[in-house]
């Protein structure tokens, strides 16, 4: 084997010493020396560091601002950041979930293909032939046209992607 060419994985080089990094949840106070060890301190309340590090300051936990429609999905620890999500009826505008927007509704003629979540918007699809949607909704799928035949009725008015068919009684033959 070759001679060593670097400090070990959880170490960093400073002043000819391979010093231990600080563990997640702790920040660096002072580097190690020939006689002293790396000095680390736990992050304070509402702070975190999620990796082995030599940071002198911990990061602040993310604030889930209710004015932006945000709420806490998972409380942060000294080793993890807070995870925000959106209030009911809203979804994140980005992966980082820094703000929220209202779920969009599907217009008449369109139905909901996928209901929105805290992180994704509503996905709409046009109602195909044989289906309709006459409302603007974030939940309603396209409904199938009514089957007049099963009701012993006939189609009096054809359906569209926005309206149902209109059924009526069959014409009676005069004697």
């Amino acid at each position: 084997p070759e001679p060593p060419t670097a400090c070990r994985e959880k170490q960093y080089l400073i002043n000819s010493q391979c010093c231990s990094l600080c563990q997640p949840g702790q920040k660096l106070v002072s580097d190690c020396t020939e006689f002293t060890e790396t000095e680390c301190l736990p992050c304070g309340e509402s702070e975190f560091l999620d990796t082995w590090n030599r940071e002198t300051h911990c990061h602040q936990h993310k604030y889930c601002d209710p004015n932006l429609g945000l709420r806490v999905q998972q409380k942060g620890t000294s080793e993890t950041d807070t995870i925000c999500t959106c209030e009911e009826g809203w979804h994140c505008t980005s992966e980082a979930c820094e703000s929220c927007v209202l779920h969009r509704s599907c217009s008449p003629g369109f139905g909901v293909k996928q209901i929105a979540t805290g992180v994704s918007d509503t996905i709409c699809e046009p109602c195909p032939v044989g289906f309709f949607s006459n409302v603007s909704s974030a939940f309603e799928k396209c409904h199938p046209w009514t089957s007049c035949e099963t009701k012993d009725l006939v189609v009096q008015q054809a359906g569209t992607n926005k309206t149902d068919v209109v059924c009526g009684p069959q014409d009676r033959l005069r004697a």
């Epitope: 084997p1 001679p3 400090c7 070990r8 959880k10 080089l13 790396t38």
Partner: antibody, heavy 125, light 107 residues
């Protein structure tokens, strides 16, 4: 201060196993590799292997492969060395020692900068 | 494995004497050599690394030299606390290997 405190002396019969512990204090235990070495009566030092306390990865000397197991418990900052199928020539003082890499004059080298007090293991029928 | 050969295996000396211990590596190890001192019943402690660098706190009467395959440790004026066993160790490759030791006894 940095300290490695080992478990007490053991007397074992041939064929048995022994498990020696090494409790670290005064430094970030997962941050430095731990070596295990032994010294037979009146003999030199013999390296048995190392354990990376962070990952649990090990590297054993060829001579001890299949007989030695090094483990660690990071929650109590303790490394363990178990040697099985003991023979009389395993009678020795067993040491744990912290590996401290340094950089000097443009090259790296590994040093055993802190040692445990040693654990005497006697194998006798 | 790299063979480390130390000589002499033991020596008798008096307080104030100049003492030199040699260590030979079975292959070129550049300057990847550490010296350890071991007092009776105690764990070894680092004396010199690598080859000639003296850690702070180690008395200046100790000195190391050499590179490649031939190394030496010199104690310029032996003191009562210097009696014990001295080991050389190569850190060039795994496994790290040690010399057989040199026991320095009181004459």
């Amino acid at each position: 201060q940095v300290q490695l405190v080992q478990s007490g002396a053991e007397v074992k019969k041939p064929g048995a196993s022994v498990k020696v512990s090494c409790k670290a204090s005064g430094y970030t235990f997962p941050g430095y590799y731990m070596y295990w070495l032994r010294q037979a009566p009146g003999q030199g030092l013999e390296w048995m292997g190392w354990i990376n306390p962070d990952s649990g990865d090990t590297n054993y000397a060829q001579k001890f492969q299949g007989r030695v197991t090094m483990t660690r418990d990071t929650s109590i900052s303790t490394a363990f060395m178990e040697l099985s199928r003991l023979r009389s020539d395993d009678t020795a003082v067993y040491y744990c020692a912290r590996e401290k890499p340094r950089y000097f004059d443009s090259f790296y080298y590994y040093l055993m900068d802190v040692w445990g007090q040693g654990t005497t293991v006697t194998v006798s029928s | 494995d790299i063979q480390m050969t130390q000589s002499p295996s033991s020596l008798s000396a008096s307080v104030g004497d100049r003492v030199t211990i040699t260590c030979r590596a079975g292959q070129n190890i550049a300057r990847h050599l550490n010296w350890y001192q071991q007092n009776p019943g105690k764990a070894p402690k680092v004396l010199i690394h690598p080859a000639s660098s003296l850690p702070s706190g180690v008395p200046s009467r100790f000195s190391g030299s050499g590179s490649g395959t031939d190394f030496s440790l010199t104690i310029s004026s032996l003191q009562p606390e210097d009696f014990g066993t001295y080991f050389c160790q190569q850190s060039y490759s795994t496994p790290p290997t040690f010399g057989g030791g040199t026991k320095v006894e009181l004459k």
